[in-house]
């Protein structure tokens, strides 16, 4: 069941998700001069069973100059930088490394994919929260956040963390001493 | 909470115009299309077409073109329809949806009337 | 563009019962159907995504499956505030069009 809301937004913070549960969905969002192709679906799902789960539907962008054409644009090299979450490459190295049952990884990059992702989490989804660089975390808490249902409606919890001063970021789980981390190695990101 | 709140009931004249909006709240605006569809009793749901606040794209369903017109303003978190050279036909219940079609606005019933 | 086909326009069932209601779609659209349930005067609400996910509060006595072409919405165990009609919709290719919809009756 999809969460009707977004994540709680922290001031000078991101989240990303460790994986994502079966029926979430990606939008098929492009960077600035180009937009998602007229057919096929607006964006991606993890679907799946229990055994093995995985995105269907793939994301494309085209010119946005040529309204009416299907044709795929390569990028340039240049372009390709224009991603702004950093630790991406990281992230995706290590997500060959664990699996966990009913849920995906995050997807691979497409070309001139738009810099922020916007997912449509399900109830049962945690997400992490790390401060920014240049800020300090504060936590009276877990650094996290859950979509949960309660008297048929979805929350997202909220997570205990307040992101101050000027410091090294935070880590995400995973990142820091294995003790740390509640779920295993993260395998996906997103940023906000 | 996420909501799509439309403008209210329209009485006009054919030939005129007609300009309704539909204001998101409880989500970020510029993160995801805003569609429009149209109810008339006998005749189902048309697609109109929709429009990405962020990307400032416009899709419109070839038999809508010409005769609506989409916008949005983003400081106000509001998208808008027009519908021009009113007729009959046009008189009908418009929706705005959101968030890949999880939420529909009330709606605004359209009345074209001499 | 791709057209989507409601074959019947009313369906009768009761209280209890089990109701599958089908929707056929002109082309190939994979799985992106989504349905919706829209009351006497109220405005649609979406129950699945991607034929065969719920969306958050849809009791889970609707389901829905299919994939390519034919899709069903099956409602088990109907009660009384099922009363309503039911559309589906392509959204695979552009336009995004809808079925005629298909209106459940309560002996």
């Known amino acids: 069941e999809l969460c009707d809301d977004d994540p709680p937004k922290i001031t000078h913070a991101t989240f990303k998700a460790v994986a994502y549960k079966e029926g979430t969905m990606l939008n098929c969002e492009c960077k600035r001069g180009f937009r998602r192709i007229k057919s096929g679906s607006p964006y991606m799902l993890c679907t799946g069973n229990s055994s093995h789960s995985s995105w269907d539907n793939q994301c494309q962008c085209t010119s946005s100059a040529a309204r009416n054409t299907t044709k795929q644009v390569t990028p340039q090299p240049e372009e390709q930088k224009e991603r702004k979450t950093t630790e991406m490459q990281s992230q995706m190295q290590l997500a060959d490394q664990v699996s966990l049952p009913g849920h995906c990884r995050e997807p691979p990059p497409w070309e001139n994919e738009a810099t922020e992702r916007i997912y449509h989490f399900v109830v049962g989804q945690t997400v992490y929260y790390q401060c920014v660089q240049g800020y300090r975390a504060l936590h009276r808490g877990p650094a996290e956040s859950v979509c949960k249902m309660t008297h048929g409606k979805t929350r997202w919890t909220q997570p205990q963390l307040i992101c101050t001063g000027e410091t090294e970021p935070s880590q995400f789980p995973g990142e820091e001493e294995p003790q740390a981390s509640p779920d295993g190695l993260p395998e996906s990101e997103t940023s906000r | 909470q996420v909501q799509l709140q439309q403008s209210g009931a329209e009485l006009v004249r054919p030939g005129t115009s007609v300009k309704m909006s539909c204001k998101a709240a409880?989500?970020?605006?510029?993160?995801?299309?805003i569609g429009w569809v149209k109810q008339r009793p006998g005749h189902g749901l048309e697609w109109i077409g929709d429009?990405?606040?962020?990307?400032?794209?416009?899709d419109y369903n070839e038999k809508f073109t010409g005769k609506a017109t989409l916008t949005a303003d983003t400081s106000s978190s509001t998208a808008y329809m027009q519908l021009s050279s009113l007729t009959s036909e046009d008189s009908a219940i418009y929706y705005c949806?959101?968030?890949?079609?999880?939420?529909w606005g009330q709606g605004t019933l359209v009345t074209v009337s001499a | 563009d791709t057209t989507v086909t409601q074959s019947q326009k009313f369906m009768s069932t009761s209280v209890g019962d089990r109701v599958s209601v089908t929707c056929k779609a002109s082309?190939?659209?994979?799985?992106?159907v989504a349905w919706y349930q829209q009351k006497p005067g109220q405005s649609p609400k979406a129950l699945i995504y991607?034929?065969?996910y719920r969306y958050s509060g849809v009791p889970d006595r609707f389901t829905g499956s299919g994939s390519g072409t034919d899709f069903t919405l099956t409602i088990s165990n109907v009660q009384s505030e099922d009363l309503a009609e039911y559309f589906c919709?392509?959204?695979?290719?552009?336009?995004?069009?809808f079925g005629g919809g298909t209106k459940l009756e309560i002996k």
């Open positions: 949806v959101s968030r890949n079609f999880a939420k």
């Open positions: 082309q190939n659209v994979g799985t992106n």
């Open positions: 429009i990405h606040p962020g990307g400032g794209y416009i």
């Open positions: 919709q392509q959204y695979n290719s552009y336009p995004y069009t």
């Open positions: 991607s034929a065969s």
């Open positions: 409880g989500y970020t605006f510029t993160n995801y299309w």
